[in-house]
């Protein structure tokens, strides 16, 4: 039985052409604004685009098993067609200016045509011949043709208005279309030649289809579906009236989907897409950014690419003229992506969602979604706000900063916590990037009024400030381990700078026409950055040969960018921390000589096996507990006394700032202010008696060290000056008497 199917914004309806069972709605839920429509007769399914939901959906003819097959990266998918032989779905998007293909279930999506497309609209396929045809509604409306893999594009009909309802008469080998600007229904041969006007007296023809000897069209002025003889335009009949804004129309019948090509047999033995082409019959195609292997059958995933995030999307981009530059990754439930990273070993994407305050991961195809760090830990009454993340691929750890707790945390890739490695009362670590090849991490510390860029070992020790001047809001960091360079973007100063990994050789790379840099990454010889305000991805050649280039424009709500380069497994395995985390229970560090050293997060200490971390021993209240090392407990008086008694120097870390009534020794030790310049060294480093400008009274003697004593105590055989200078030069023939 033949049916007329038509989409009318909120519903899709059918009319039997044989029994006149008129206008039955297919029971579909959630249709908002159905636009393009097609079917797969062997599966008894219909497919439609929804330009309000920005989805492509399918369901059986009885309305059952409704599912969205494409739900990402669509804007105005106003043209769509089913390749019934290759079991592929083609669509044209007037918003993204792309023609794309996927399997009928939405898998293996690829962009076929993206260059010089101006509002592609109607789309028709001829899979037995290997051609696709489409109309463009842009500045110069036309009808184009290409092979069904996107190659060999040519313009067939250049002199046409906004052509719609493009339809192929497969039996008579002719094209039909409506022209919205001239209100004509026209026809041509398959090369756009032998053009004929079929109807020229219609008020507003819009949708069109063909079946047997008739063409069927919708008229927006008459609010009707009508038919006429396909060659003469005569014998007109109104099929249905009182229909508003019918967007698309087609005839559901097996005769509209006949023929054969190699893709109809075992998918042409292709691993992903089988695409019909002229002469050659078919070619195997790959998902976007994948490459066809030498066997011309199977595909390999990309290993070198860029990832960039927007508020609610993560995109992949390749720098390849033959490939569509960027595609959206099908990852669900992205609310507010703040930062992204990638693990090239497991090929997993990691991101921070600042709406949900969590760190999540997934495969690039959206599968295996998993929450690595949850938004709150009720048992600890701890709220977190992850800000940035960086993966140590060797130890399999995520280093991440937190806006709520102002610490740097370490979490295993499977979500198990390692602990806090950096925490300080004044600290506000934000951007973070690890350099596990050298055992360091770099972070911006947005302390109020004194922002810094710092470096520390991966366990938080060996902390040093690299930069504290010439910074306002260093918002993003990037690192090139190969070149040994650190890069940062300052969103207040609107500039991008670089230095060596030690902080030397600081230079400004770019400071013009940068409005709101929010992300940086190094990719081959280029430094890429994203500018949120300019909605742009840009790059600068670090060799200085090619300068600055715009990569992509008009990308709203950009948040981060991250380069992925192919993982050299041989090099990877040579890293001493790559095998079982170097044997360490917690943090594995590479020493200068290439060997490993195990360390611990702040709340744990390294045990005697020098591999495992454990709870620190309990010291008495009169004692200070060293963070790590053999010596565990020291007298509390030795804390911040200017001398390191703990092996890990932790007794001299984060020393308090002295109060107003105290004097701070050079070592950081605090003493009573009254003891300053009293002639006795109360600071262990004796700095309280340095630079003392003391004038003694008339009845006092001034010791060599500046101390004042009573004049009568000079040369009295008692040592009163702490430097013994009161008893010097008194007795020409005898030593001063020993002190009582």
């Amino acid at each position: 039985e033949a049916f007329l199917l038509f989409s009318r914004r909120a519903d899709i309806r059918r009319i039997s052409l044989e029994t006149n069972n008129n206008n039955v709605a297919i029971p579909l839920t959630g249709v908002k604004e159905a636009s393009a429509l097609d079917f797969d007769v062997t599966d008894n399914r219909i497919y439609w685009t929804d330009i309000s939901l920005k989805t492509i959906s399918r369901a059986f003819m009885n309305g059952s098993a409704l599912e969205h097959v494409v739900e990402f990266g669509l804007d105005y998918p106003e043209g769509m067609a089913v390749d019934w032989l290759g079991k592929n779905l083609y669509w044209a998007d007037t918003g993204t200016n792309r023609i794309e293909v996927s399997k009928l279930d939405g898998q293996h999506r690829q962009v076929l045509v993206w260059k010089d497309l101006d509002s592609p609209r109607a789309l028709a396929l001829d899979p037995a011949e290997g051609f696709m045809y489409w109309t463009e509604w842009g500045g110069k409306p036309k009808i184009d043709r290409a092979a069904m893999d996107g190659s060999e594009r040519t313009t067939l009909v250049p002199n046409v208005g906004r052509a719609n309802g493009l339809t192929i008469d497969y039996a008579k080998r002719r094209l039909y279309w409506t022209d919205l600007d001239t209100n004509l229904i026209e026809s041509s041969n398959m090369l756009g030649l032998n053009r004929e006007v079929i109807a020229d007296d219609l008020p507003h023809p819009f949708g069109l289809t063909q079946y047997q000897d008739y063409i069927y069209w919708t008229d927006w002025s008459r609010r009707s579906i009508e038919r006429a003889n396909k060659t003469s335009g005569q014998n007109r009949t109104i099929i249905q009236g009182h229909l508003d804004y019918v967007m698309d129309i087609l005839v559901f019948h097996s005769s509209r989907q006949s023929g054969w090509n190699e893709c109809a047999s075992s998918n042409g033995h292709c691993s992903h897409l089988c695409l019909a082409v002229p002469v050659g019959g078919f070619v195997c195609g790959c998902p976007a950014h994948y490459s066809l292997n030498a066997d011309n059958r199977t595909c390999s995933a990309p290993t070198t690419f860029l990832l960039f995030s927007q508020k609610s999307a993560i995109n992949r981009m390749v720098i390849d003229e033959q490939q569509s530059p960027d595609i959206i990754l099908p990852i669900h439930s992205l609310r507010n992506v703040r930062a992204i990273d990638y693990d090239p070993l497991d090929k997993q994407l990691y991101w921070i969602d600042s709406r949900q305050n969590m760190i999540r991961k997934a495969q690039e195809d959206g599968s295996q979604g998993f929450t690595v760090v949850v938004s709150s830990v009720p048992s600890q009454n701890l709220e977190i706000q992850p800000y940035d993340l960086s993966i140590d691929i060797y130890s399999r750890y995520i280093y991440w900063t937190c806006e709520a707790t102002n610490v740097i945390n370490v979490t295993r890739l499977d979500g198990r916590s390692v602990g806090v490695v950096l925490k300080g009362e004044q600290d506000r670590p934000r951007a973070v990037v690890v350099n596990p090849e050298k055992g360091y991490m770099y972070f911006t510390n947005l302390q109020e009024r004194s922002p810094k860029i710092e470096r520390a070992a991966l366990d938080g020790t060996e902390r040093e400030v690299l930069f504290f001047s010439g910074l306002s809001k260093p918002i993003a960091l990037a690192l090139d381990s190969r070149l040994g360079k650190l890069f940062w973007a300052d969103s207040d100063l609107r500039r991008i700078e670089s230095s060596d990994l030690s902080g030397a050789n600081r230079i400004v790379l770019e400071d013009s026409n940068i409005l709101q840099p929010v992300g940086l990454t190094v990719f081959e010889n280029w430094l890429y950055w994203i500018d949120k305000q300019q909605q742009m991805i840009e790059k600068i050649d670090m060799t200085g040969r090619e300068g600055r280039t715009k990569v992509q424009a008009r990308i709203a709500q950009l948040s981060d960018i991250h380069a992925v380069k192919e993982l050299n497994l041989q090099e990877y395995r040579q890293h001493p921390c790559a095998q079982d985390n170097g044997g360490c229970s917690h943090i594995c560090l590479v020493k200068g000589d290439g060997t490993t050293r195990c360390s611990c997060p702040m709340h744990l200490v390294l045990l005697q096996d020098e591999l495992s971390c454990g709870e620190p021993p309990t010291c008495s209240p009169q004692q200070f507990t060293c963070f790590t090392g053999e010596i565990d407990c020291i007298p509390v008086a030795w804390r911040c006394d200017g001398f390191t008694e703990c092996e890990d120097h932790s007794d001299e870390l984060n020393c308090p700032v002295c109060s107003e009534s105290q004097f701070q020794c050079a070592s950081g030790q605090c003493i009573d202010g009254a003891l300053r310049c009293n002639g006795d060294a109360n600071c262990q480093d004796k700095s309280d008696e340095k630079n003392c400008e003391v004038l003694c009274l008339i009845d006092q003697f001034r010791c060599a060290n500046g101390q004042c004593i009573g004049k009568h105590k000079k040369c009295d055989h008692n040592v009163d000056c702490s430097d013994k200078s009161d008893e010097l030069d008194c007795y020409p023939t005898e030593e001063p008497a020993p002190q009582a």
Epitope: S151, N189, P278, V279, G280, G281
Partner: antibody, heavy 120, light 108 residues
Framework: QVQLQESGGGLVQPGGSLRLSCAAS????????MSWVRQAPGKGLEWVSS????????SYADSVKGRFTISRDNAKNSLYLQMNSLRVDDTAVYYC?????????????WGRGTLVTVSS | SELTQDPAVSVALGQTVRITCQGD??????ASWYQQKPGQAPVVVIY???NRPSGIPDRFSGSSSGNSASLTITGAQAEDEADYYC????????????FGGGTKLTVL
């Protein structure tokens, strides 16, 4: 007017080479798939090779694969067939044919042919 | 995969004649029919389901069923005397065009 004109045929010894050309005029050559079809003396038609409009896709009959090369130059409206390692059984009239008005496999337009004779 | 035709068929002037073609590929693809007169290049007379190029008289028609295709000339004329070749794509999947062996039509 619409026409195809073959040239380049002639007598060649076995193992030798020839290059056939086909000049097209009167139609949009660059939109058509083009083919070579041959006919041995007193025999039927045999398809030899086809090339898509943009030269991306090429196909050969098993009997000539590896020996013949089809090519085209759309700027010159020309089709070519480079024939190497010629054999006696390659002796035939070689026709250039255009396909595309309706299908890649319906040859709408044929040239008059050029005779290739392979003989020692 | 091959296309098989009767080597020769004859028809009385003004009568109807049917030239047949058989082959597995015809289950998947439409046949096209070519007319070739002595010393001339072939000319397509029928393509697709039953399509005639412009300039081909309407006495020529095509039909197909299963693995068989037919060219029918209703009211054969003297000028129809020629060799007729059927052709289709090869369904083996190696992208070849196939020609039948040809049928010599004699108009008596």
């Amino acid at each position: 007017q619409v026409q195809l004109q073959e040239s380049g045929g002639g007598l060649v010894q076995p193992g030798g080479s020839l290059r056939l050309s086909c000049a097209a005029s009167g139609f949009t050559f660059s939109s058509y798939a083009m083919s070579w079809v041959r006919q041995a003396p007193g025999k039927g038609l045999e398809w030899v090779s086809s090339i898509s409009s943009g030269s991306t896709y090429i196909s050969y009959a098993d009997s000539v694969k590896g020996r013949f090369t089809i090519s085209r130059d759309n700027a010159k409206n020309s089709l070519y067939l480079q024939m190497n390692s010629l054999r006696v059984d390659d002796t035939a009239v070689y026709y250039c044919a255009a396909a595309g008005g309706a299908s890649n496999w319906y040859f709408d337009l044929w040239g008059r042919g050029t005779l290739v004779t392979v003989s020692s | 995969s091959e296309l098989t035709q009767d080597p020769a068929v004859s028809v009385a002037l003004g009568q109807t004649v049917r030239i047949t073609c058989q082959g597995d590929s015809l289950r998947s693809f439409d046949a096209s029919w070519y007319q070739q007169k002595p010393g001339q290049a072939p000319v397509v007379v029928i393509y697709g389901e039953n399509n005639r190029p412009s300039g081909i008289p309407d006495r020529f028609s095509g039909s197909s069923s299963g693995n068989s295709a037919s060219l029918t000339i209703t009211g054969a004329q003297a000028e129809d005397e020629a060799d007729y070749y059927c052709s289709s794509r090869d369904s083996r999947g190696n992208h070849l065009a196939l020609f039948g062996g040809g049928t010599k039509l004699t108009v008596l």
